[in-house]
């Protein structure tokens, strides 16, 4: 998302359709307090940022309340009165949904249903990843709502789970960000565990009849 204008690189993240974070990296102005000016309507005057992000004592970004705002952010990064980067962007291209909340697990024999609170907007995918110490990679399953059933689990194994939310590419484009992962939770025989042993425990011998 960065720009070539005067060597200024920018990054935009639209957190959960609520807050926009614009950060910049401008080597030419590394010891300068650049200012950030913005508007959500092309007809309005620019406002200056009131919530700057600082890096090594100098401005490096701005956090904006953008809840229920129009789709377009018009902004200008300036050195004094001189604009060093000016752009207008559809904010939703840079959507990052919030991390899943109220994650719950419901076990029934060799299957688990993972649920969480659906976000208030649509066109999202809720992804559950899981693995046991026997697995070399995470397995994944995703659904359009936060109600994901995973079948074919081994009740004797310990499984680690975590959940995240992704914006559908067909709707929001390919340059969005997935949410942060929920905390990892570990389960074995339908009960929560502190952790799954890194070394897989050998299977119990079958008792001869």
């Amino acid at each position: 998302q960065g720009g070539a204008a005067e060597g200024v690189q920018i990054q935009i993240i639209y957190f959960n359709l609520e807050t926009v974070q614009v950060t910049w990296n401008a080597s030419k102005y590394s010891r300068t307090n650049l200012t950030f000016h913005y508007r959500f309507n092309g007809d309005e005057a620019y406002d200056q940022c009131t919530n700057y992000l600082l890096q090594e004592g100098h401005t490096s970004g701005c956090l904006l309340d953008a809840e229920q705002r129009d789709d377009i952010l018009y902004f200008s990064i300036r050195n004094g009165t001189h604009p060093v980067f000016t752009a207008s962007r559809w904010m939703v291209y840079y959507l990052k949904p919030s991390s899943p909340k109220h994650v719950r697990f419901s076990w029934h024999q060799d299957a688990v249903t993972v649920t969480c609170s659906d976000l208030s907007y649509g066109d999202l995918l809720y992804e559950v990843q899981y693995r046991s110490p026997f697995d070399t990679e995470w397995q994944s399953k995703q659904e359009n709502t936060c109600n994901v059933t995973i079948e074919g689990l081994d009740a004797e194994k310990c499984y680690s789970f975590w959940v995240r939310v992704k914006a559908m590419e067909d709707v929001y484009g390919p340059d969005t960000y997935p949410s942060d992962w929920s905390e990892v939770t570990c389960w074995q025989r339908g009960e929560i565990r502190d952790a799954c042993a890194e070394t897989p425990t050998p299977p119990k011998p079958k008792l001869s009849k």
């Epitope: 998302q1 920018i10 207008s88 962007r89 559809w90 067909d170 709707v171 484009g173 390919p174």
Partner: antibody
Amino acid sequence: QIQLQESGPGLVKPSQSLSLTCSVTGFSITTSGYYWTWIRQFPGKKLEWMGYIGYNSKTYYNPSLKSRISITRDTSKNQFLLHLNSVTTEDTATYYCARSLYGGYKDAFDSWGQGTLVTVSS
Amino acid sequence: DVVLTQTPATLSAIPGERVTMTCKASQSIGTSLHWYQHRPNETPRLLIKFASRSITGIPSRFSGSGSGTDFTLGINNLEAEDFAIYYCQQSPGFPPTFGSGTKLEIN
């Protein structure tokens, strides 16, 4: 199969208004998630996006035209309309209507009309 | 506005060849860059969306690549119907903008 067809006068006098209609068949313009747009191509082949109207009636206009442009729709006829005021010879172009890809974010244009040439001349 | 610069302005080739053309954006636009083909007296046609994603019904000899500011459209095994003007278009910047076009002509 969606089809778009532009219609309107081929000749407009300077300072007058230009009005064009895009008739859509095979697809409803109120289908959620789709935006409907006007794009023009100048005689030198340069393309310019003019504006959108959404499934929800929301409009967006090119800032370079904002004071002169209006896009409306007539859902009963499944049409959307372009109005451009105070035209000059610089507005001579082929005008296309188009549909944007599904998705809020107006992305690319996957269905276009054949285009209609509008000449501004006295 | 995001300015898109297409090169070359004109490209001469013969059927059966492979050609590439480029589109350079004045600001980084991720992968939200789309390609169109416009043949004379026809309606423009979307070829590639989001830099490299294929479109249903478009022959597989058309391919796209790139991200950030530099993008490429490639056409393998040129056919007579491919001689046309090709435009790139960006969508994250407002307003959406098009490149000035590359005219692919028969040598």
